[in-house]
């Protein structure tokens, strides 16, 4: 074998070698980048794991802070039982009396009877403050609502409920005045105003009892 | 200030019809009692028909059958409709109406000013 040629040989030898060396080269920083990729993984994942367990942490003290409050909320609760609100849920407490605003319309007796189901009888205005309140209550609406005042005929005296005189200096009663229905004539409050009608048209109504302010 | 404005009033044939309206404006609580009154020739003025506030009516015993009062709540209007008619429902017709302007005011009762109505042939 010529020099030559084995001059050839190791140059192709050496460049077998530089490629395989790169080959390695690159496998190595492959496997590094790979490495350095899964490390950070790890440690996001890591990270990770702390937040979720630092806030399961917080989560867990806010649900103990909760039942506690809990707790002190069922016992203020069964404190509280023991004490008597002046008015049934969704009436209005006024002074002596509660409000119940009715959500139908009915004829006066019906309405009446609405009332008495309920302990209560059809609104009554003993004075010029209870007066004012009501006005003040249905101010804003343009609804008639049947109170407790009626009559048999023109020739009789408005009565309330009680059979108690309507008192005159509390306010007039218009509308209807002169006329006779078989029913009777009924008195409505409209706006702060008082209409007498025929006591079997409907109308919503006012139902009043006195306030509960005995003290425990 | 409160206004009752009448329309509808005119010439007619006895047997024949007319429709009167009126209608209330200005600013007020409440309206009680709407109708109408009419004043014939040399005479008093007088009860025609009128409606309450929850609907009931009441006619003068004359019109009954052949007046028809009703009344639009929401838009503060009465009407009346006048049929077979006859020469002596010849007359100023009036609209009425109780208004509540203020609770603690005296002043109720408003009128139109009147709307001819005659019944000839």
């Known amino acids: 074998m010529q020099l030559s040629q084995v001059s050839d040989l190791l140059t192709q030898e050496q460049a077998n070698l530089t490629h395989q060396k790169k080959k390695l080269e690159g496998q190595i920083s492959a496997r590094q980048q790979a490495e350095e990729a899964s490390q950070e993984s790890e440690n996001e994942l890591k990270e990770m794991i702390e937040t979720l367990a630092r806030k399961l942490n917080e989560k867990s003290k806010e649900q103990m802070e909760l039942h506690h409050q809990n707790l002190n909320l069922q016992e203020t609760l069964k404190r509280v039982a023991n004490c008597s609100a002046p008015c049934p849920q969704d009436w209005i407490w006024h002074g002596e009396n509660c409000y119940l605003f009715s959500s139908g319309s009915f004829n006066w007796e019906k309405s009446q009877e609405k009332c008495l189901s309920l302990d209560a009888k059809l609104l009554k205005i003993n004075s010029t403050a209870d007066l004012d309140f009501i006005q003040q209550a249905i101010s804003y609406s343009s609804f008639p609502f049947w109170m407790g005042l009626s009559r048999r005929n023109p020739s009789y005296p408005w009565l309330w409920e009680d059979g108690s005189p309507l008192m005159p200096h509390l306010f007039r009663v218009r509308g209807a005045v002169s006329q006779t229905y078989p029913s009777g004539t009924c008195a409505y409050i409209q706006r702060g105003a008082v209409y007498a009608e025929n006591c079997i048209l409907a109308a919503f109504s006012i139902c009043q009892k006195k306030a509960n302010l005995r003290a425990q | 200030e409160v206004q009752l404005v009448e329309s509808g009033g005119g010439l007619v044939q006895p047997g024949g019809s007319l429709r009167l309206s009126c209608a209330a404006y200005g600013s007020f609580f409440s309206i009680g009692t709407m109708g109408w009154y009419r004043q014939p020739p040399g005479n008093q003025r007088e009860l025609v028909a009128v409606t309450y506030g929850l609907g009931s009516t009441n006619y003068a015993e004359s019109v009954k059958g052949r007046f028809t009062i009703s009344r639009d709540n929401a838009k503060n209007t009465v009407s009346l409709q006048m049929n077979s008619l006859k020469p002596e429902d010849t007359a100023v017709y009036y609209c009425?109406?109780?208004?509540?302007?203020?609770?603690?005011?005296?002043?109720?009762?408003?009128w139109g000013q009147g709307t001819q109505v005659t019944v000839s042939s």
């Open positions: 009425y109406a109780e208004i509540d302007t203020d609770p603690r005011s005296g002043e109720w009762d408003y």
